[in-house]
């Protein structure tokens, strides 16, 4: 059996439903069978899990994933496979397999596989803060989503009116979430904020720097 | 040699009911899927039913889907199609085929013509 | 469905000559592909599987080639016998659906 899955990695919002594509060509036989299992993203294909089957006429979703499977068409020998998984959990990121066989059509190993990322919207990132804060000092502000998919970009933004930093003295990551202030002045202080995004939205969070002559550093 | 002989056509009113039956020989019936297709006079082929090697799963395009049925019976190496509710569309030669590993048809019958008129 | 569309209807040929008679699938039927011959008051014979597999007893001057939505049926060199009415069939998805069918006539 040859088995056709889409060569694009699949991408479902968190808590829809995701339409796992899955079709083949066969004259289906009574001895027909169709597994669906699951791997977690990094493990090897060996790892798998089932969860759904359709053996003898029937339909047998298992696992943890059990209430939320089913076939876009049953039974699946029309020529569809397709699986649903509804209301989509980020557990349900990782590759999943769809396994038709039909003896005696042994031509391919009738498997196809699948990647699927369930997309989800920045958590509120926690903002903190490390380093000198004294003038001259130099300080980094940290910025960190624990949610998201996929990985938030950070972008940091000082807050109201106030010179323009000289060039080199702030300096940010936007993959790493951290923003490196150098040579700092007193009007370095300030509120700083922080906006994790991705494609599902954004979060923020923010942050009081305050800098000190050398005798005293600390943050509000 | 494979053959495939259809038998069953005949003349039939609007409304009506037809059996077809197809008697195979010179393969392993009980191991290929089998269909019906059919041919309306000077038109082109349409496939009208299917069904696994057990008989298992049965499958029908919309425009038959309720109306006929297909069937088998592996130990008399026969194929069998029951018409009921026919119209004057469903006028046709009917042919057998026997399926491929994949669904194209390798053998055919001859074909029983059916007339649907009043 | 999967609609599948056969050029020309007709074609008019001689023999020797070569013929190359399209078919158009409406999706992406990869390479899952049957043609036919129909000789009058015949039953259909199976050319060509899978877009190019020739069956056991079918003459090499019969050759299918394409995948996804276009596929071709090429006879090298017509002969007396080719003179038929030839249909596609995707055998991908059910339901099975066959092109219109094209006739190849004597010029």
């Known amino acids: 059996v040859e088995v056709k899955v889409p060569t694009e990695p699949l991408s479902t919002p968190l808590g829809k439903t995701a339409e796992l594509t899955c079709t083949y060509s066969t004259s289906v036989g009574d001895s027909f069978a169709l597994e669906w299992s699951f791997v977690q993203p990094g493990k090897p294909i060996s790892e798998s899990h089932p969860i759904l089957y359709f053996t003898n006429g029937h339909l047998y979703p298992t696992g943890s994933k059990s209430k939320r499977v089913s076939l876009l068409q049953n039974p699946p020998t029309v020529g569809v496979a397709t699986l649903k998984l509804t209301d989509v959990h980020p557990s349900d990121t990782g590759t999943y397999l769809c396994q038709v066989n039909n003896p005696p059509d042994f031509y391919t190993n009738g498997l196809g596989l699948i990647n699927l990322t369930v997309l989800v919207p920045p958590s509120n990132p926690l903002c903190s803060q490390s380093g000198q804060t004294s003038v001259g000092g130099s300080t980094a502000l940290r910025c960190s989503s624990s949610e998201g998919a996929p990985k938030p970009v950070y972008n940091w933004v000082r807050l109201g009116t106030f010179p323009t930093p000289s060039p080199g003295s702030m300096v940010q990551d936007e993959v790493s979430g951290q923003l490196i202030l150098t040579n700092l002045s007193l009007t370095s202080s300030g509120t700083y904020r922080c906006v994790a995004t991705n494609q599902m939205g954004s979060a923020s969070c923010e942050l009081t720097l305050s800098v000190t002559e050398p005798s005293q550093g600390r943050v509000a | 040699q494979v053959q495939l002989v259809e038998s069953g056509g005949g003349l039939v009113k609007p409304g009506g009911s037809l059996r077809l039956s197809c008697a195979a020989s010179?393969?392993?019936?009980?191991?290929?899927?089998m269909s019906w297709i059919r041919q309306a006079p000077g038109k082109g082929l349409e496939w009208v039913s299917s069904i696994s090697d057990g008989g298992l799963y049965t499958h029908y395009p919309d425009s038959v889907k309720g109306r006929f049925t297909i069937s088998r019976d592996n130990a008399k190496n026969s194929l069998y199609l029951q018409m009921n509710s026919l119209r004057a569309e469903d006028t046709a030669v009917y042919y057998c085929a026997r399926q491929g590993v994949r669904p194209f048809f390798d053998y055919w019958g001859q074909g029983t013509l059916v007339t649907v008129s009043s | 469905d999967i609609q599948m569309t056969q050029s020309p209807s007709t074609l008019s040929a001689s023999v020797g000559d070569r013929v190359t008679i399209t078919c158009r699938a409406s999706e992406n039927i990869y390479s899952y592909l049957a043609w036919y011959q129909q000789k009058p008051g015949k039953s259909p014979k199976l050319l060509v599987f899978?877009?190019?597999t020739l069956p056991e007893g079918v003459p090499s001057r019969f050759s299918g080639s394409g995948s996804g939505t276009e596929f071709t049926l090429t006879i090298s060199s017509l002969q007396p016998d080719d003179f038929a009415t030839y249909y596609c069939q995707h055998h991908y998805v059910i339901p099975w659906t066959f092109g219109q069918g094209t006739k190849v006539e004597i010029k």
């Open positions: 010179g393969f392993t019936f009980s191991n290929s899927g």
């Open positions: 899978n877009a190019e």
